[in-house]
Interface confidence: medium
């Protein structure tokens, strides 16, 4: 007959690593006589034999957790007692290992530029997963604005347009990697005016284009206000490219006004607006434009017949009692003055005076005269007729003109529209547009209108040595 023997645990419990939903087994091998009674505890709490999550076999020497949960973490002990000697105990830990799991994934976010955005990414896993973020196809780098928080969330300070895009978070530990779904960060930008409309000082009956460019996300809409009310006339052309809206308001100017460009976009239930204003004033460069009373008709006079384009419509000013006779008389008087000028100056001056007094005319509801382009006026005044112009201005200052000469129809160049700005808004003087082969001689009054581009009349390229460098105001 065997002698009684106190229990001895021959295989002490060891630490067991187990994955969630997998099986974990603790073995507690005991030698004793008589056979011991073996009980199991978890964190010092007795495991009940009828708990269906556990299986206890081999006379209690094997404890199996049938489907490990992350809450099964803890210290498991087996206690063996057979009444001989004291009870014996061995303990081991269960470490529940867990592949990364994203418990709170990021969601789509719309945020206004300049604010702070937080994309959540809460994770579980053992070992604790490290969290990183991907934007588009590339790993996202942290910087002074962009940080991954301890919680795994992505925080972006002072959100910029370039932060917009698709993001996903990545949770990684030694057991695996988990990816969130792609989410979209949309950055909304308050409407902002990039290019404000410019103020214009124009002649009556001019066409003016006011341009306003705005940016924003969503793309703003642009509306125009004239003197506080919606614009009643004019045409608006709009184009959108790369989130920039370009609006051009073309106006036919018959009165001065304050024009405001308003750019608006919507952010949720709120709107953002930006405004810029420009004035359009009417330059008083001649009385006839001030009242702009007149009509368009073919030129039937003689003095400017060779200068003006054949069959062209010209503007006649009805502030004169008999406009056609009055204007012809004015040009006739001016013509006599021109007899004394140099052969270089005369054709240019004739072209200037004829085109200024008999301006090209656009018929319509309001007949519109088209003034000479500023650059052509300057070329006549400063290049072709520099000496004469200086002398004439000197006489004017000293009051030496004979009766009626104060009406000499000489434009003030600086008040005329620039061809550089809008080549369609003014009249060119064809006699200043030379043929290449005519550079060395002054063209006849009936020369054609090709273009060449010499800046002045240097002695090296022309047969007459003319210095254009005279001071003119």
């Amino acid at each position: 007959e065997k002698l009684p023997k106190a229990p001895v645990i021959t295989t002490p419990l060891e630490t067991v690593d187990a994955l969630v939903e997998e099986v974990a087994t603790f073995m507690c091998a005991v030698e004793s006589y008589p056979q011991p009674e073996i009980s199991w505890t978890r964190n010092k709490i007795l495991i009940k034999l009828f708990d269906t999550r556990y299986s206890i076999r081999e006379n209690g020497q094997l404890l199996t957790i049938l489907s490990v949960e992350d809450s099964d973490d803890g210290i498991y002990c087996c206690i063996a007692n057979n009444g001989v000697g004291g009870a014996v105990e061995s303990c081991g830990a269960l470490q529940v290992k867990m592949k990364p799991k994203i418990t709170r994934p990021p969601i789509n976010v719309k945020i206004i530029e300049g604010l702070k955005a937080v994309l959540p990414c809460t994770t579980m896993g053992n070992p604790k997963p490290s969290v990183s973020w991907i934007k588009g196809d590339n790993a996202l780098r942290e910087n002074s604005r962009i940080a991954v928080l301890e919680s795994g969330s992505l925080r972006i300070h002072n959100v910029q347009k370039e932060d917009a895009g698709q993001y996903r978070c990545v949770a990684k530990n030694s057991l695996g990697t988990a990816y969130s779904k792609l989410v979209k960060l949309e950055v909304e930008v308050f409407a902002r005016i990039l290019r404000a409309p410019e103020s214009h000082n124009v002649t009556f009956g001019s066409f003016v284009t006011l341009r306003c460019t705005a940016i924003g996300i969503p793309v703003p809409t642009i509306s125009w206000i004239e003197n506080g009310n919606a614009v009643s006339s004019g045409s608006i052309q709009e184009s959108v490219k790369d989130r920039v809206i370009d609006s051009r308001l073309q106006l036919f100017i018959t009165k001065p006004g304050l024009y405001t460009c308003i750019a608006t976009n919507k952010h949720g239930e709120k709107f953002s607006t930006a405004k810029a204003a420009a004035t359009v004033s009417i330059a008083e460069w001649s009385k006839s434009q001030k009242d702009s009373q007149g009509y368009c008709a073919q030129y039937r006079g003689e003095v400017c017949d060779a200068v003006l384009a054949k069959d062209a419509l010209v503007f006649f000013n009805t502030s004169y009692r008999d406009p056609e006779d009055a204007q012809e008389l004015l040009i006739h008087t001016a013509w006599n003055e021109l007899k004394a000028v140099s052969p270089l100056c005369r054709p240019a001056a004739e072209a200037l005076l004829c085109n200024h007094l008999f301006q090209e005319c656009s018929p319509g509801v309001v007949p519109t005269p088209m003034p000479i382009c500023r650059e052509y006026c300057l070329a006549v005044k400063e290049l072709f007729c520099a000496k004469e112009w200086q002398a004439m201005e000197g006489k004017a200052h000293r009051g030496l003109y004979r009766s009626g000469m104060h009406l000499l129809p000489v434009p003030e160049c600086s008040k005329l529209p620039s061809m550089h700005r809008d080549p369609t808004a003014c009249t060119r003087l064809p006699y200043l547009d030379y043929k290449k082969e005519n550079i060395t001689t002054f063209p006849s009054i009936t020369s054609s209108r090709p273009s060449a581009d010499i800046p002045n009349l240097p002695a090296s390229t022309s047969s007459f040595a003319v210095s254009p460098a005279y001071s003119m105001t």
């Epitope: 650059e375 060449a452 581009d453 254009p468």
Partner: antibody, heavy 124, light 107 residues
């Protein structure tokens, strides 16, 4: 969109030669003037040469006259600056610029479009 | 050659200040004078042409004027983006000349 793109710059020894090109697009090359303007390191702008495409007339600064030649190929919309007998004082960023407008009018326009510049270094 | 003498060669100013830069031609010239703005490492940009015409897209705080052989560029209310070097240029004669430049710095 108007564009001017210079090329051909680089390092050259004193007495050597270089040819700069200015490729133009977005405007009517044949009725514009093309200018070369240079800027020595830390210095101001210095006009070098001009060509008036439709007439072929050319003008040069005294400092480069006889050494530099400006030309244009209107079929290729390209202007050139042939630089010979280069000196250390020719070291600069060379810009090409254009001004529009016909004949006399062009001088009133200013140089409204410029290239990004190309660096010419003359050093032994 | 026509010389363009620009003054001052540099100036310090604050945002909101009115700034005036002058160019004096060595002899009588036409209105074929332009003003440019240049920032470091960039090409110049046209501001004013024909002595007083504002180039398209240039803010209206910039203006140009002429009195005899003196040409003036005025910035009515200096903005942060206006700190740069400014040049005048004449093309009144076939030999173009630039002023020596005025650097506008932050005070």
């Amino acid at each position: 969109e108007v564009q001017l793109v210079e090329s051909g710059g680089g390092l050259v020894q004193p007495g050597g030669s270089l040819r700069l090109s200015c490729a133009a697009s977005g405007f009517t090359f044949s009725s514009s003037s093309i200018h070369w303007v240079r800027q020595a390191p830390g210095k101001g702008l210095e006009w070098v040469a001009s060509i008036y495409s439709s007439s072929g007339s050319t003008y040069y600064a005294d400092s480069v006259k006889g050494r530099f030649t400006i030309s244009a190929d209107t079929s290729k919309n390209t202007a050139y600056l042939q630089m010979n007998s280069l000196r250390a004082e020719d070291t600069a960023v060379y810009y090409c610029a254009r001004s529009g407008g016909e004949f006399y009018i062009t001088s009133y326009y200013g140089m409204d479009y410029w290239g990004q510049g190309t660096l010419v270094t003359v050093s032994s | 050659d026509i010389q363009m003498t620009q003054s001052p060669s540099s100036l310090s100013a604050s945002v909101g200040d009115r700034v005036t830069i002058t160019c004096r031609a060595s002899q009588s010239v036409s209105s074929a004078v332009a003003w440019y703005q240049q920032k470091p490492g960039k090409a110049p940009k046209l501001l004013i042409y024909s002595a007083s015409s504002l180039y398209s897209g240039v803010p209206s705080r910039f203006s140009g004027s002429r009195s005899g052989t003196d040409f003036t560029l005025t910035i009515s209310s200096l903005q942060p983006e206006d700190f740069a070097t400014y040049y005048c240029q004449q093309s009144s004669s076939s030999l173009i000349t630039f002023g020596q430049g005025t650097k506008v710095e932050i005070k």
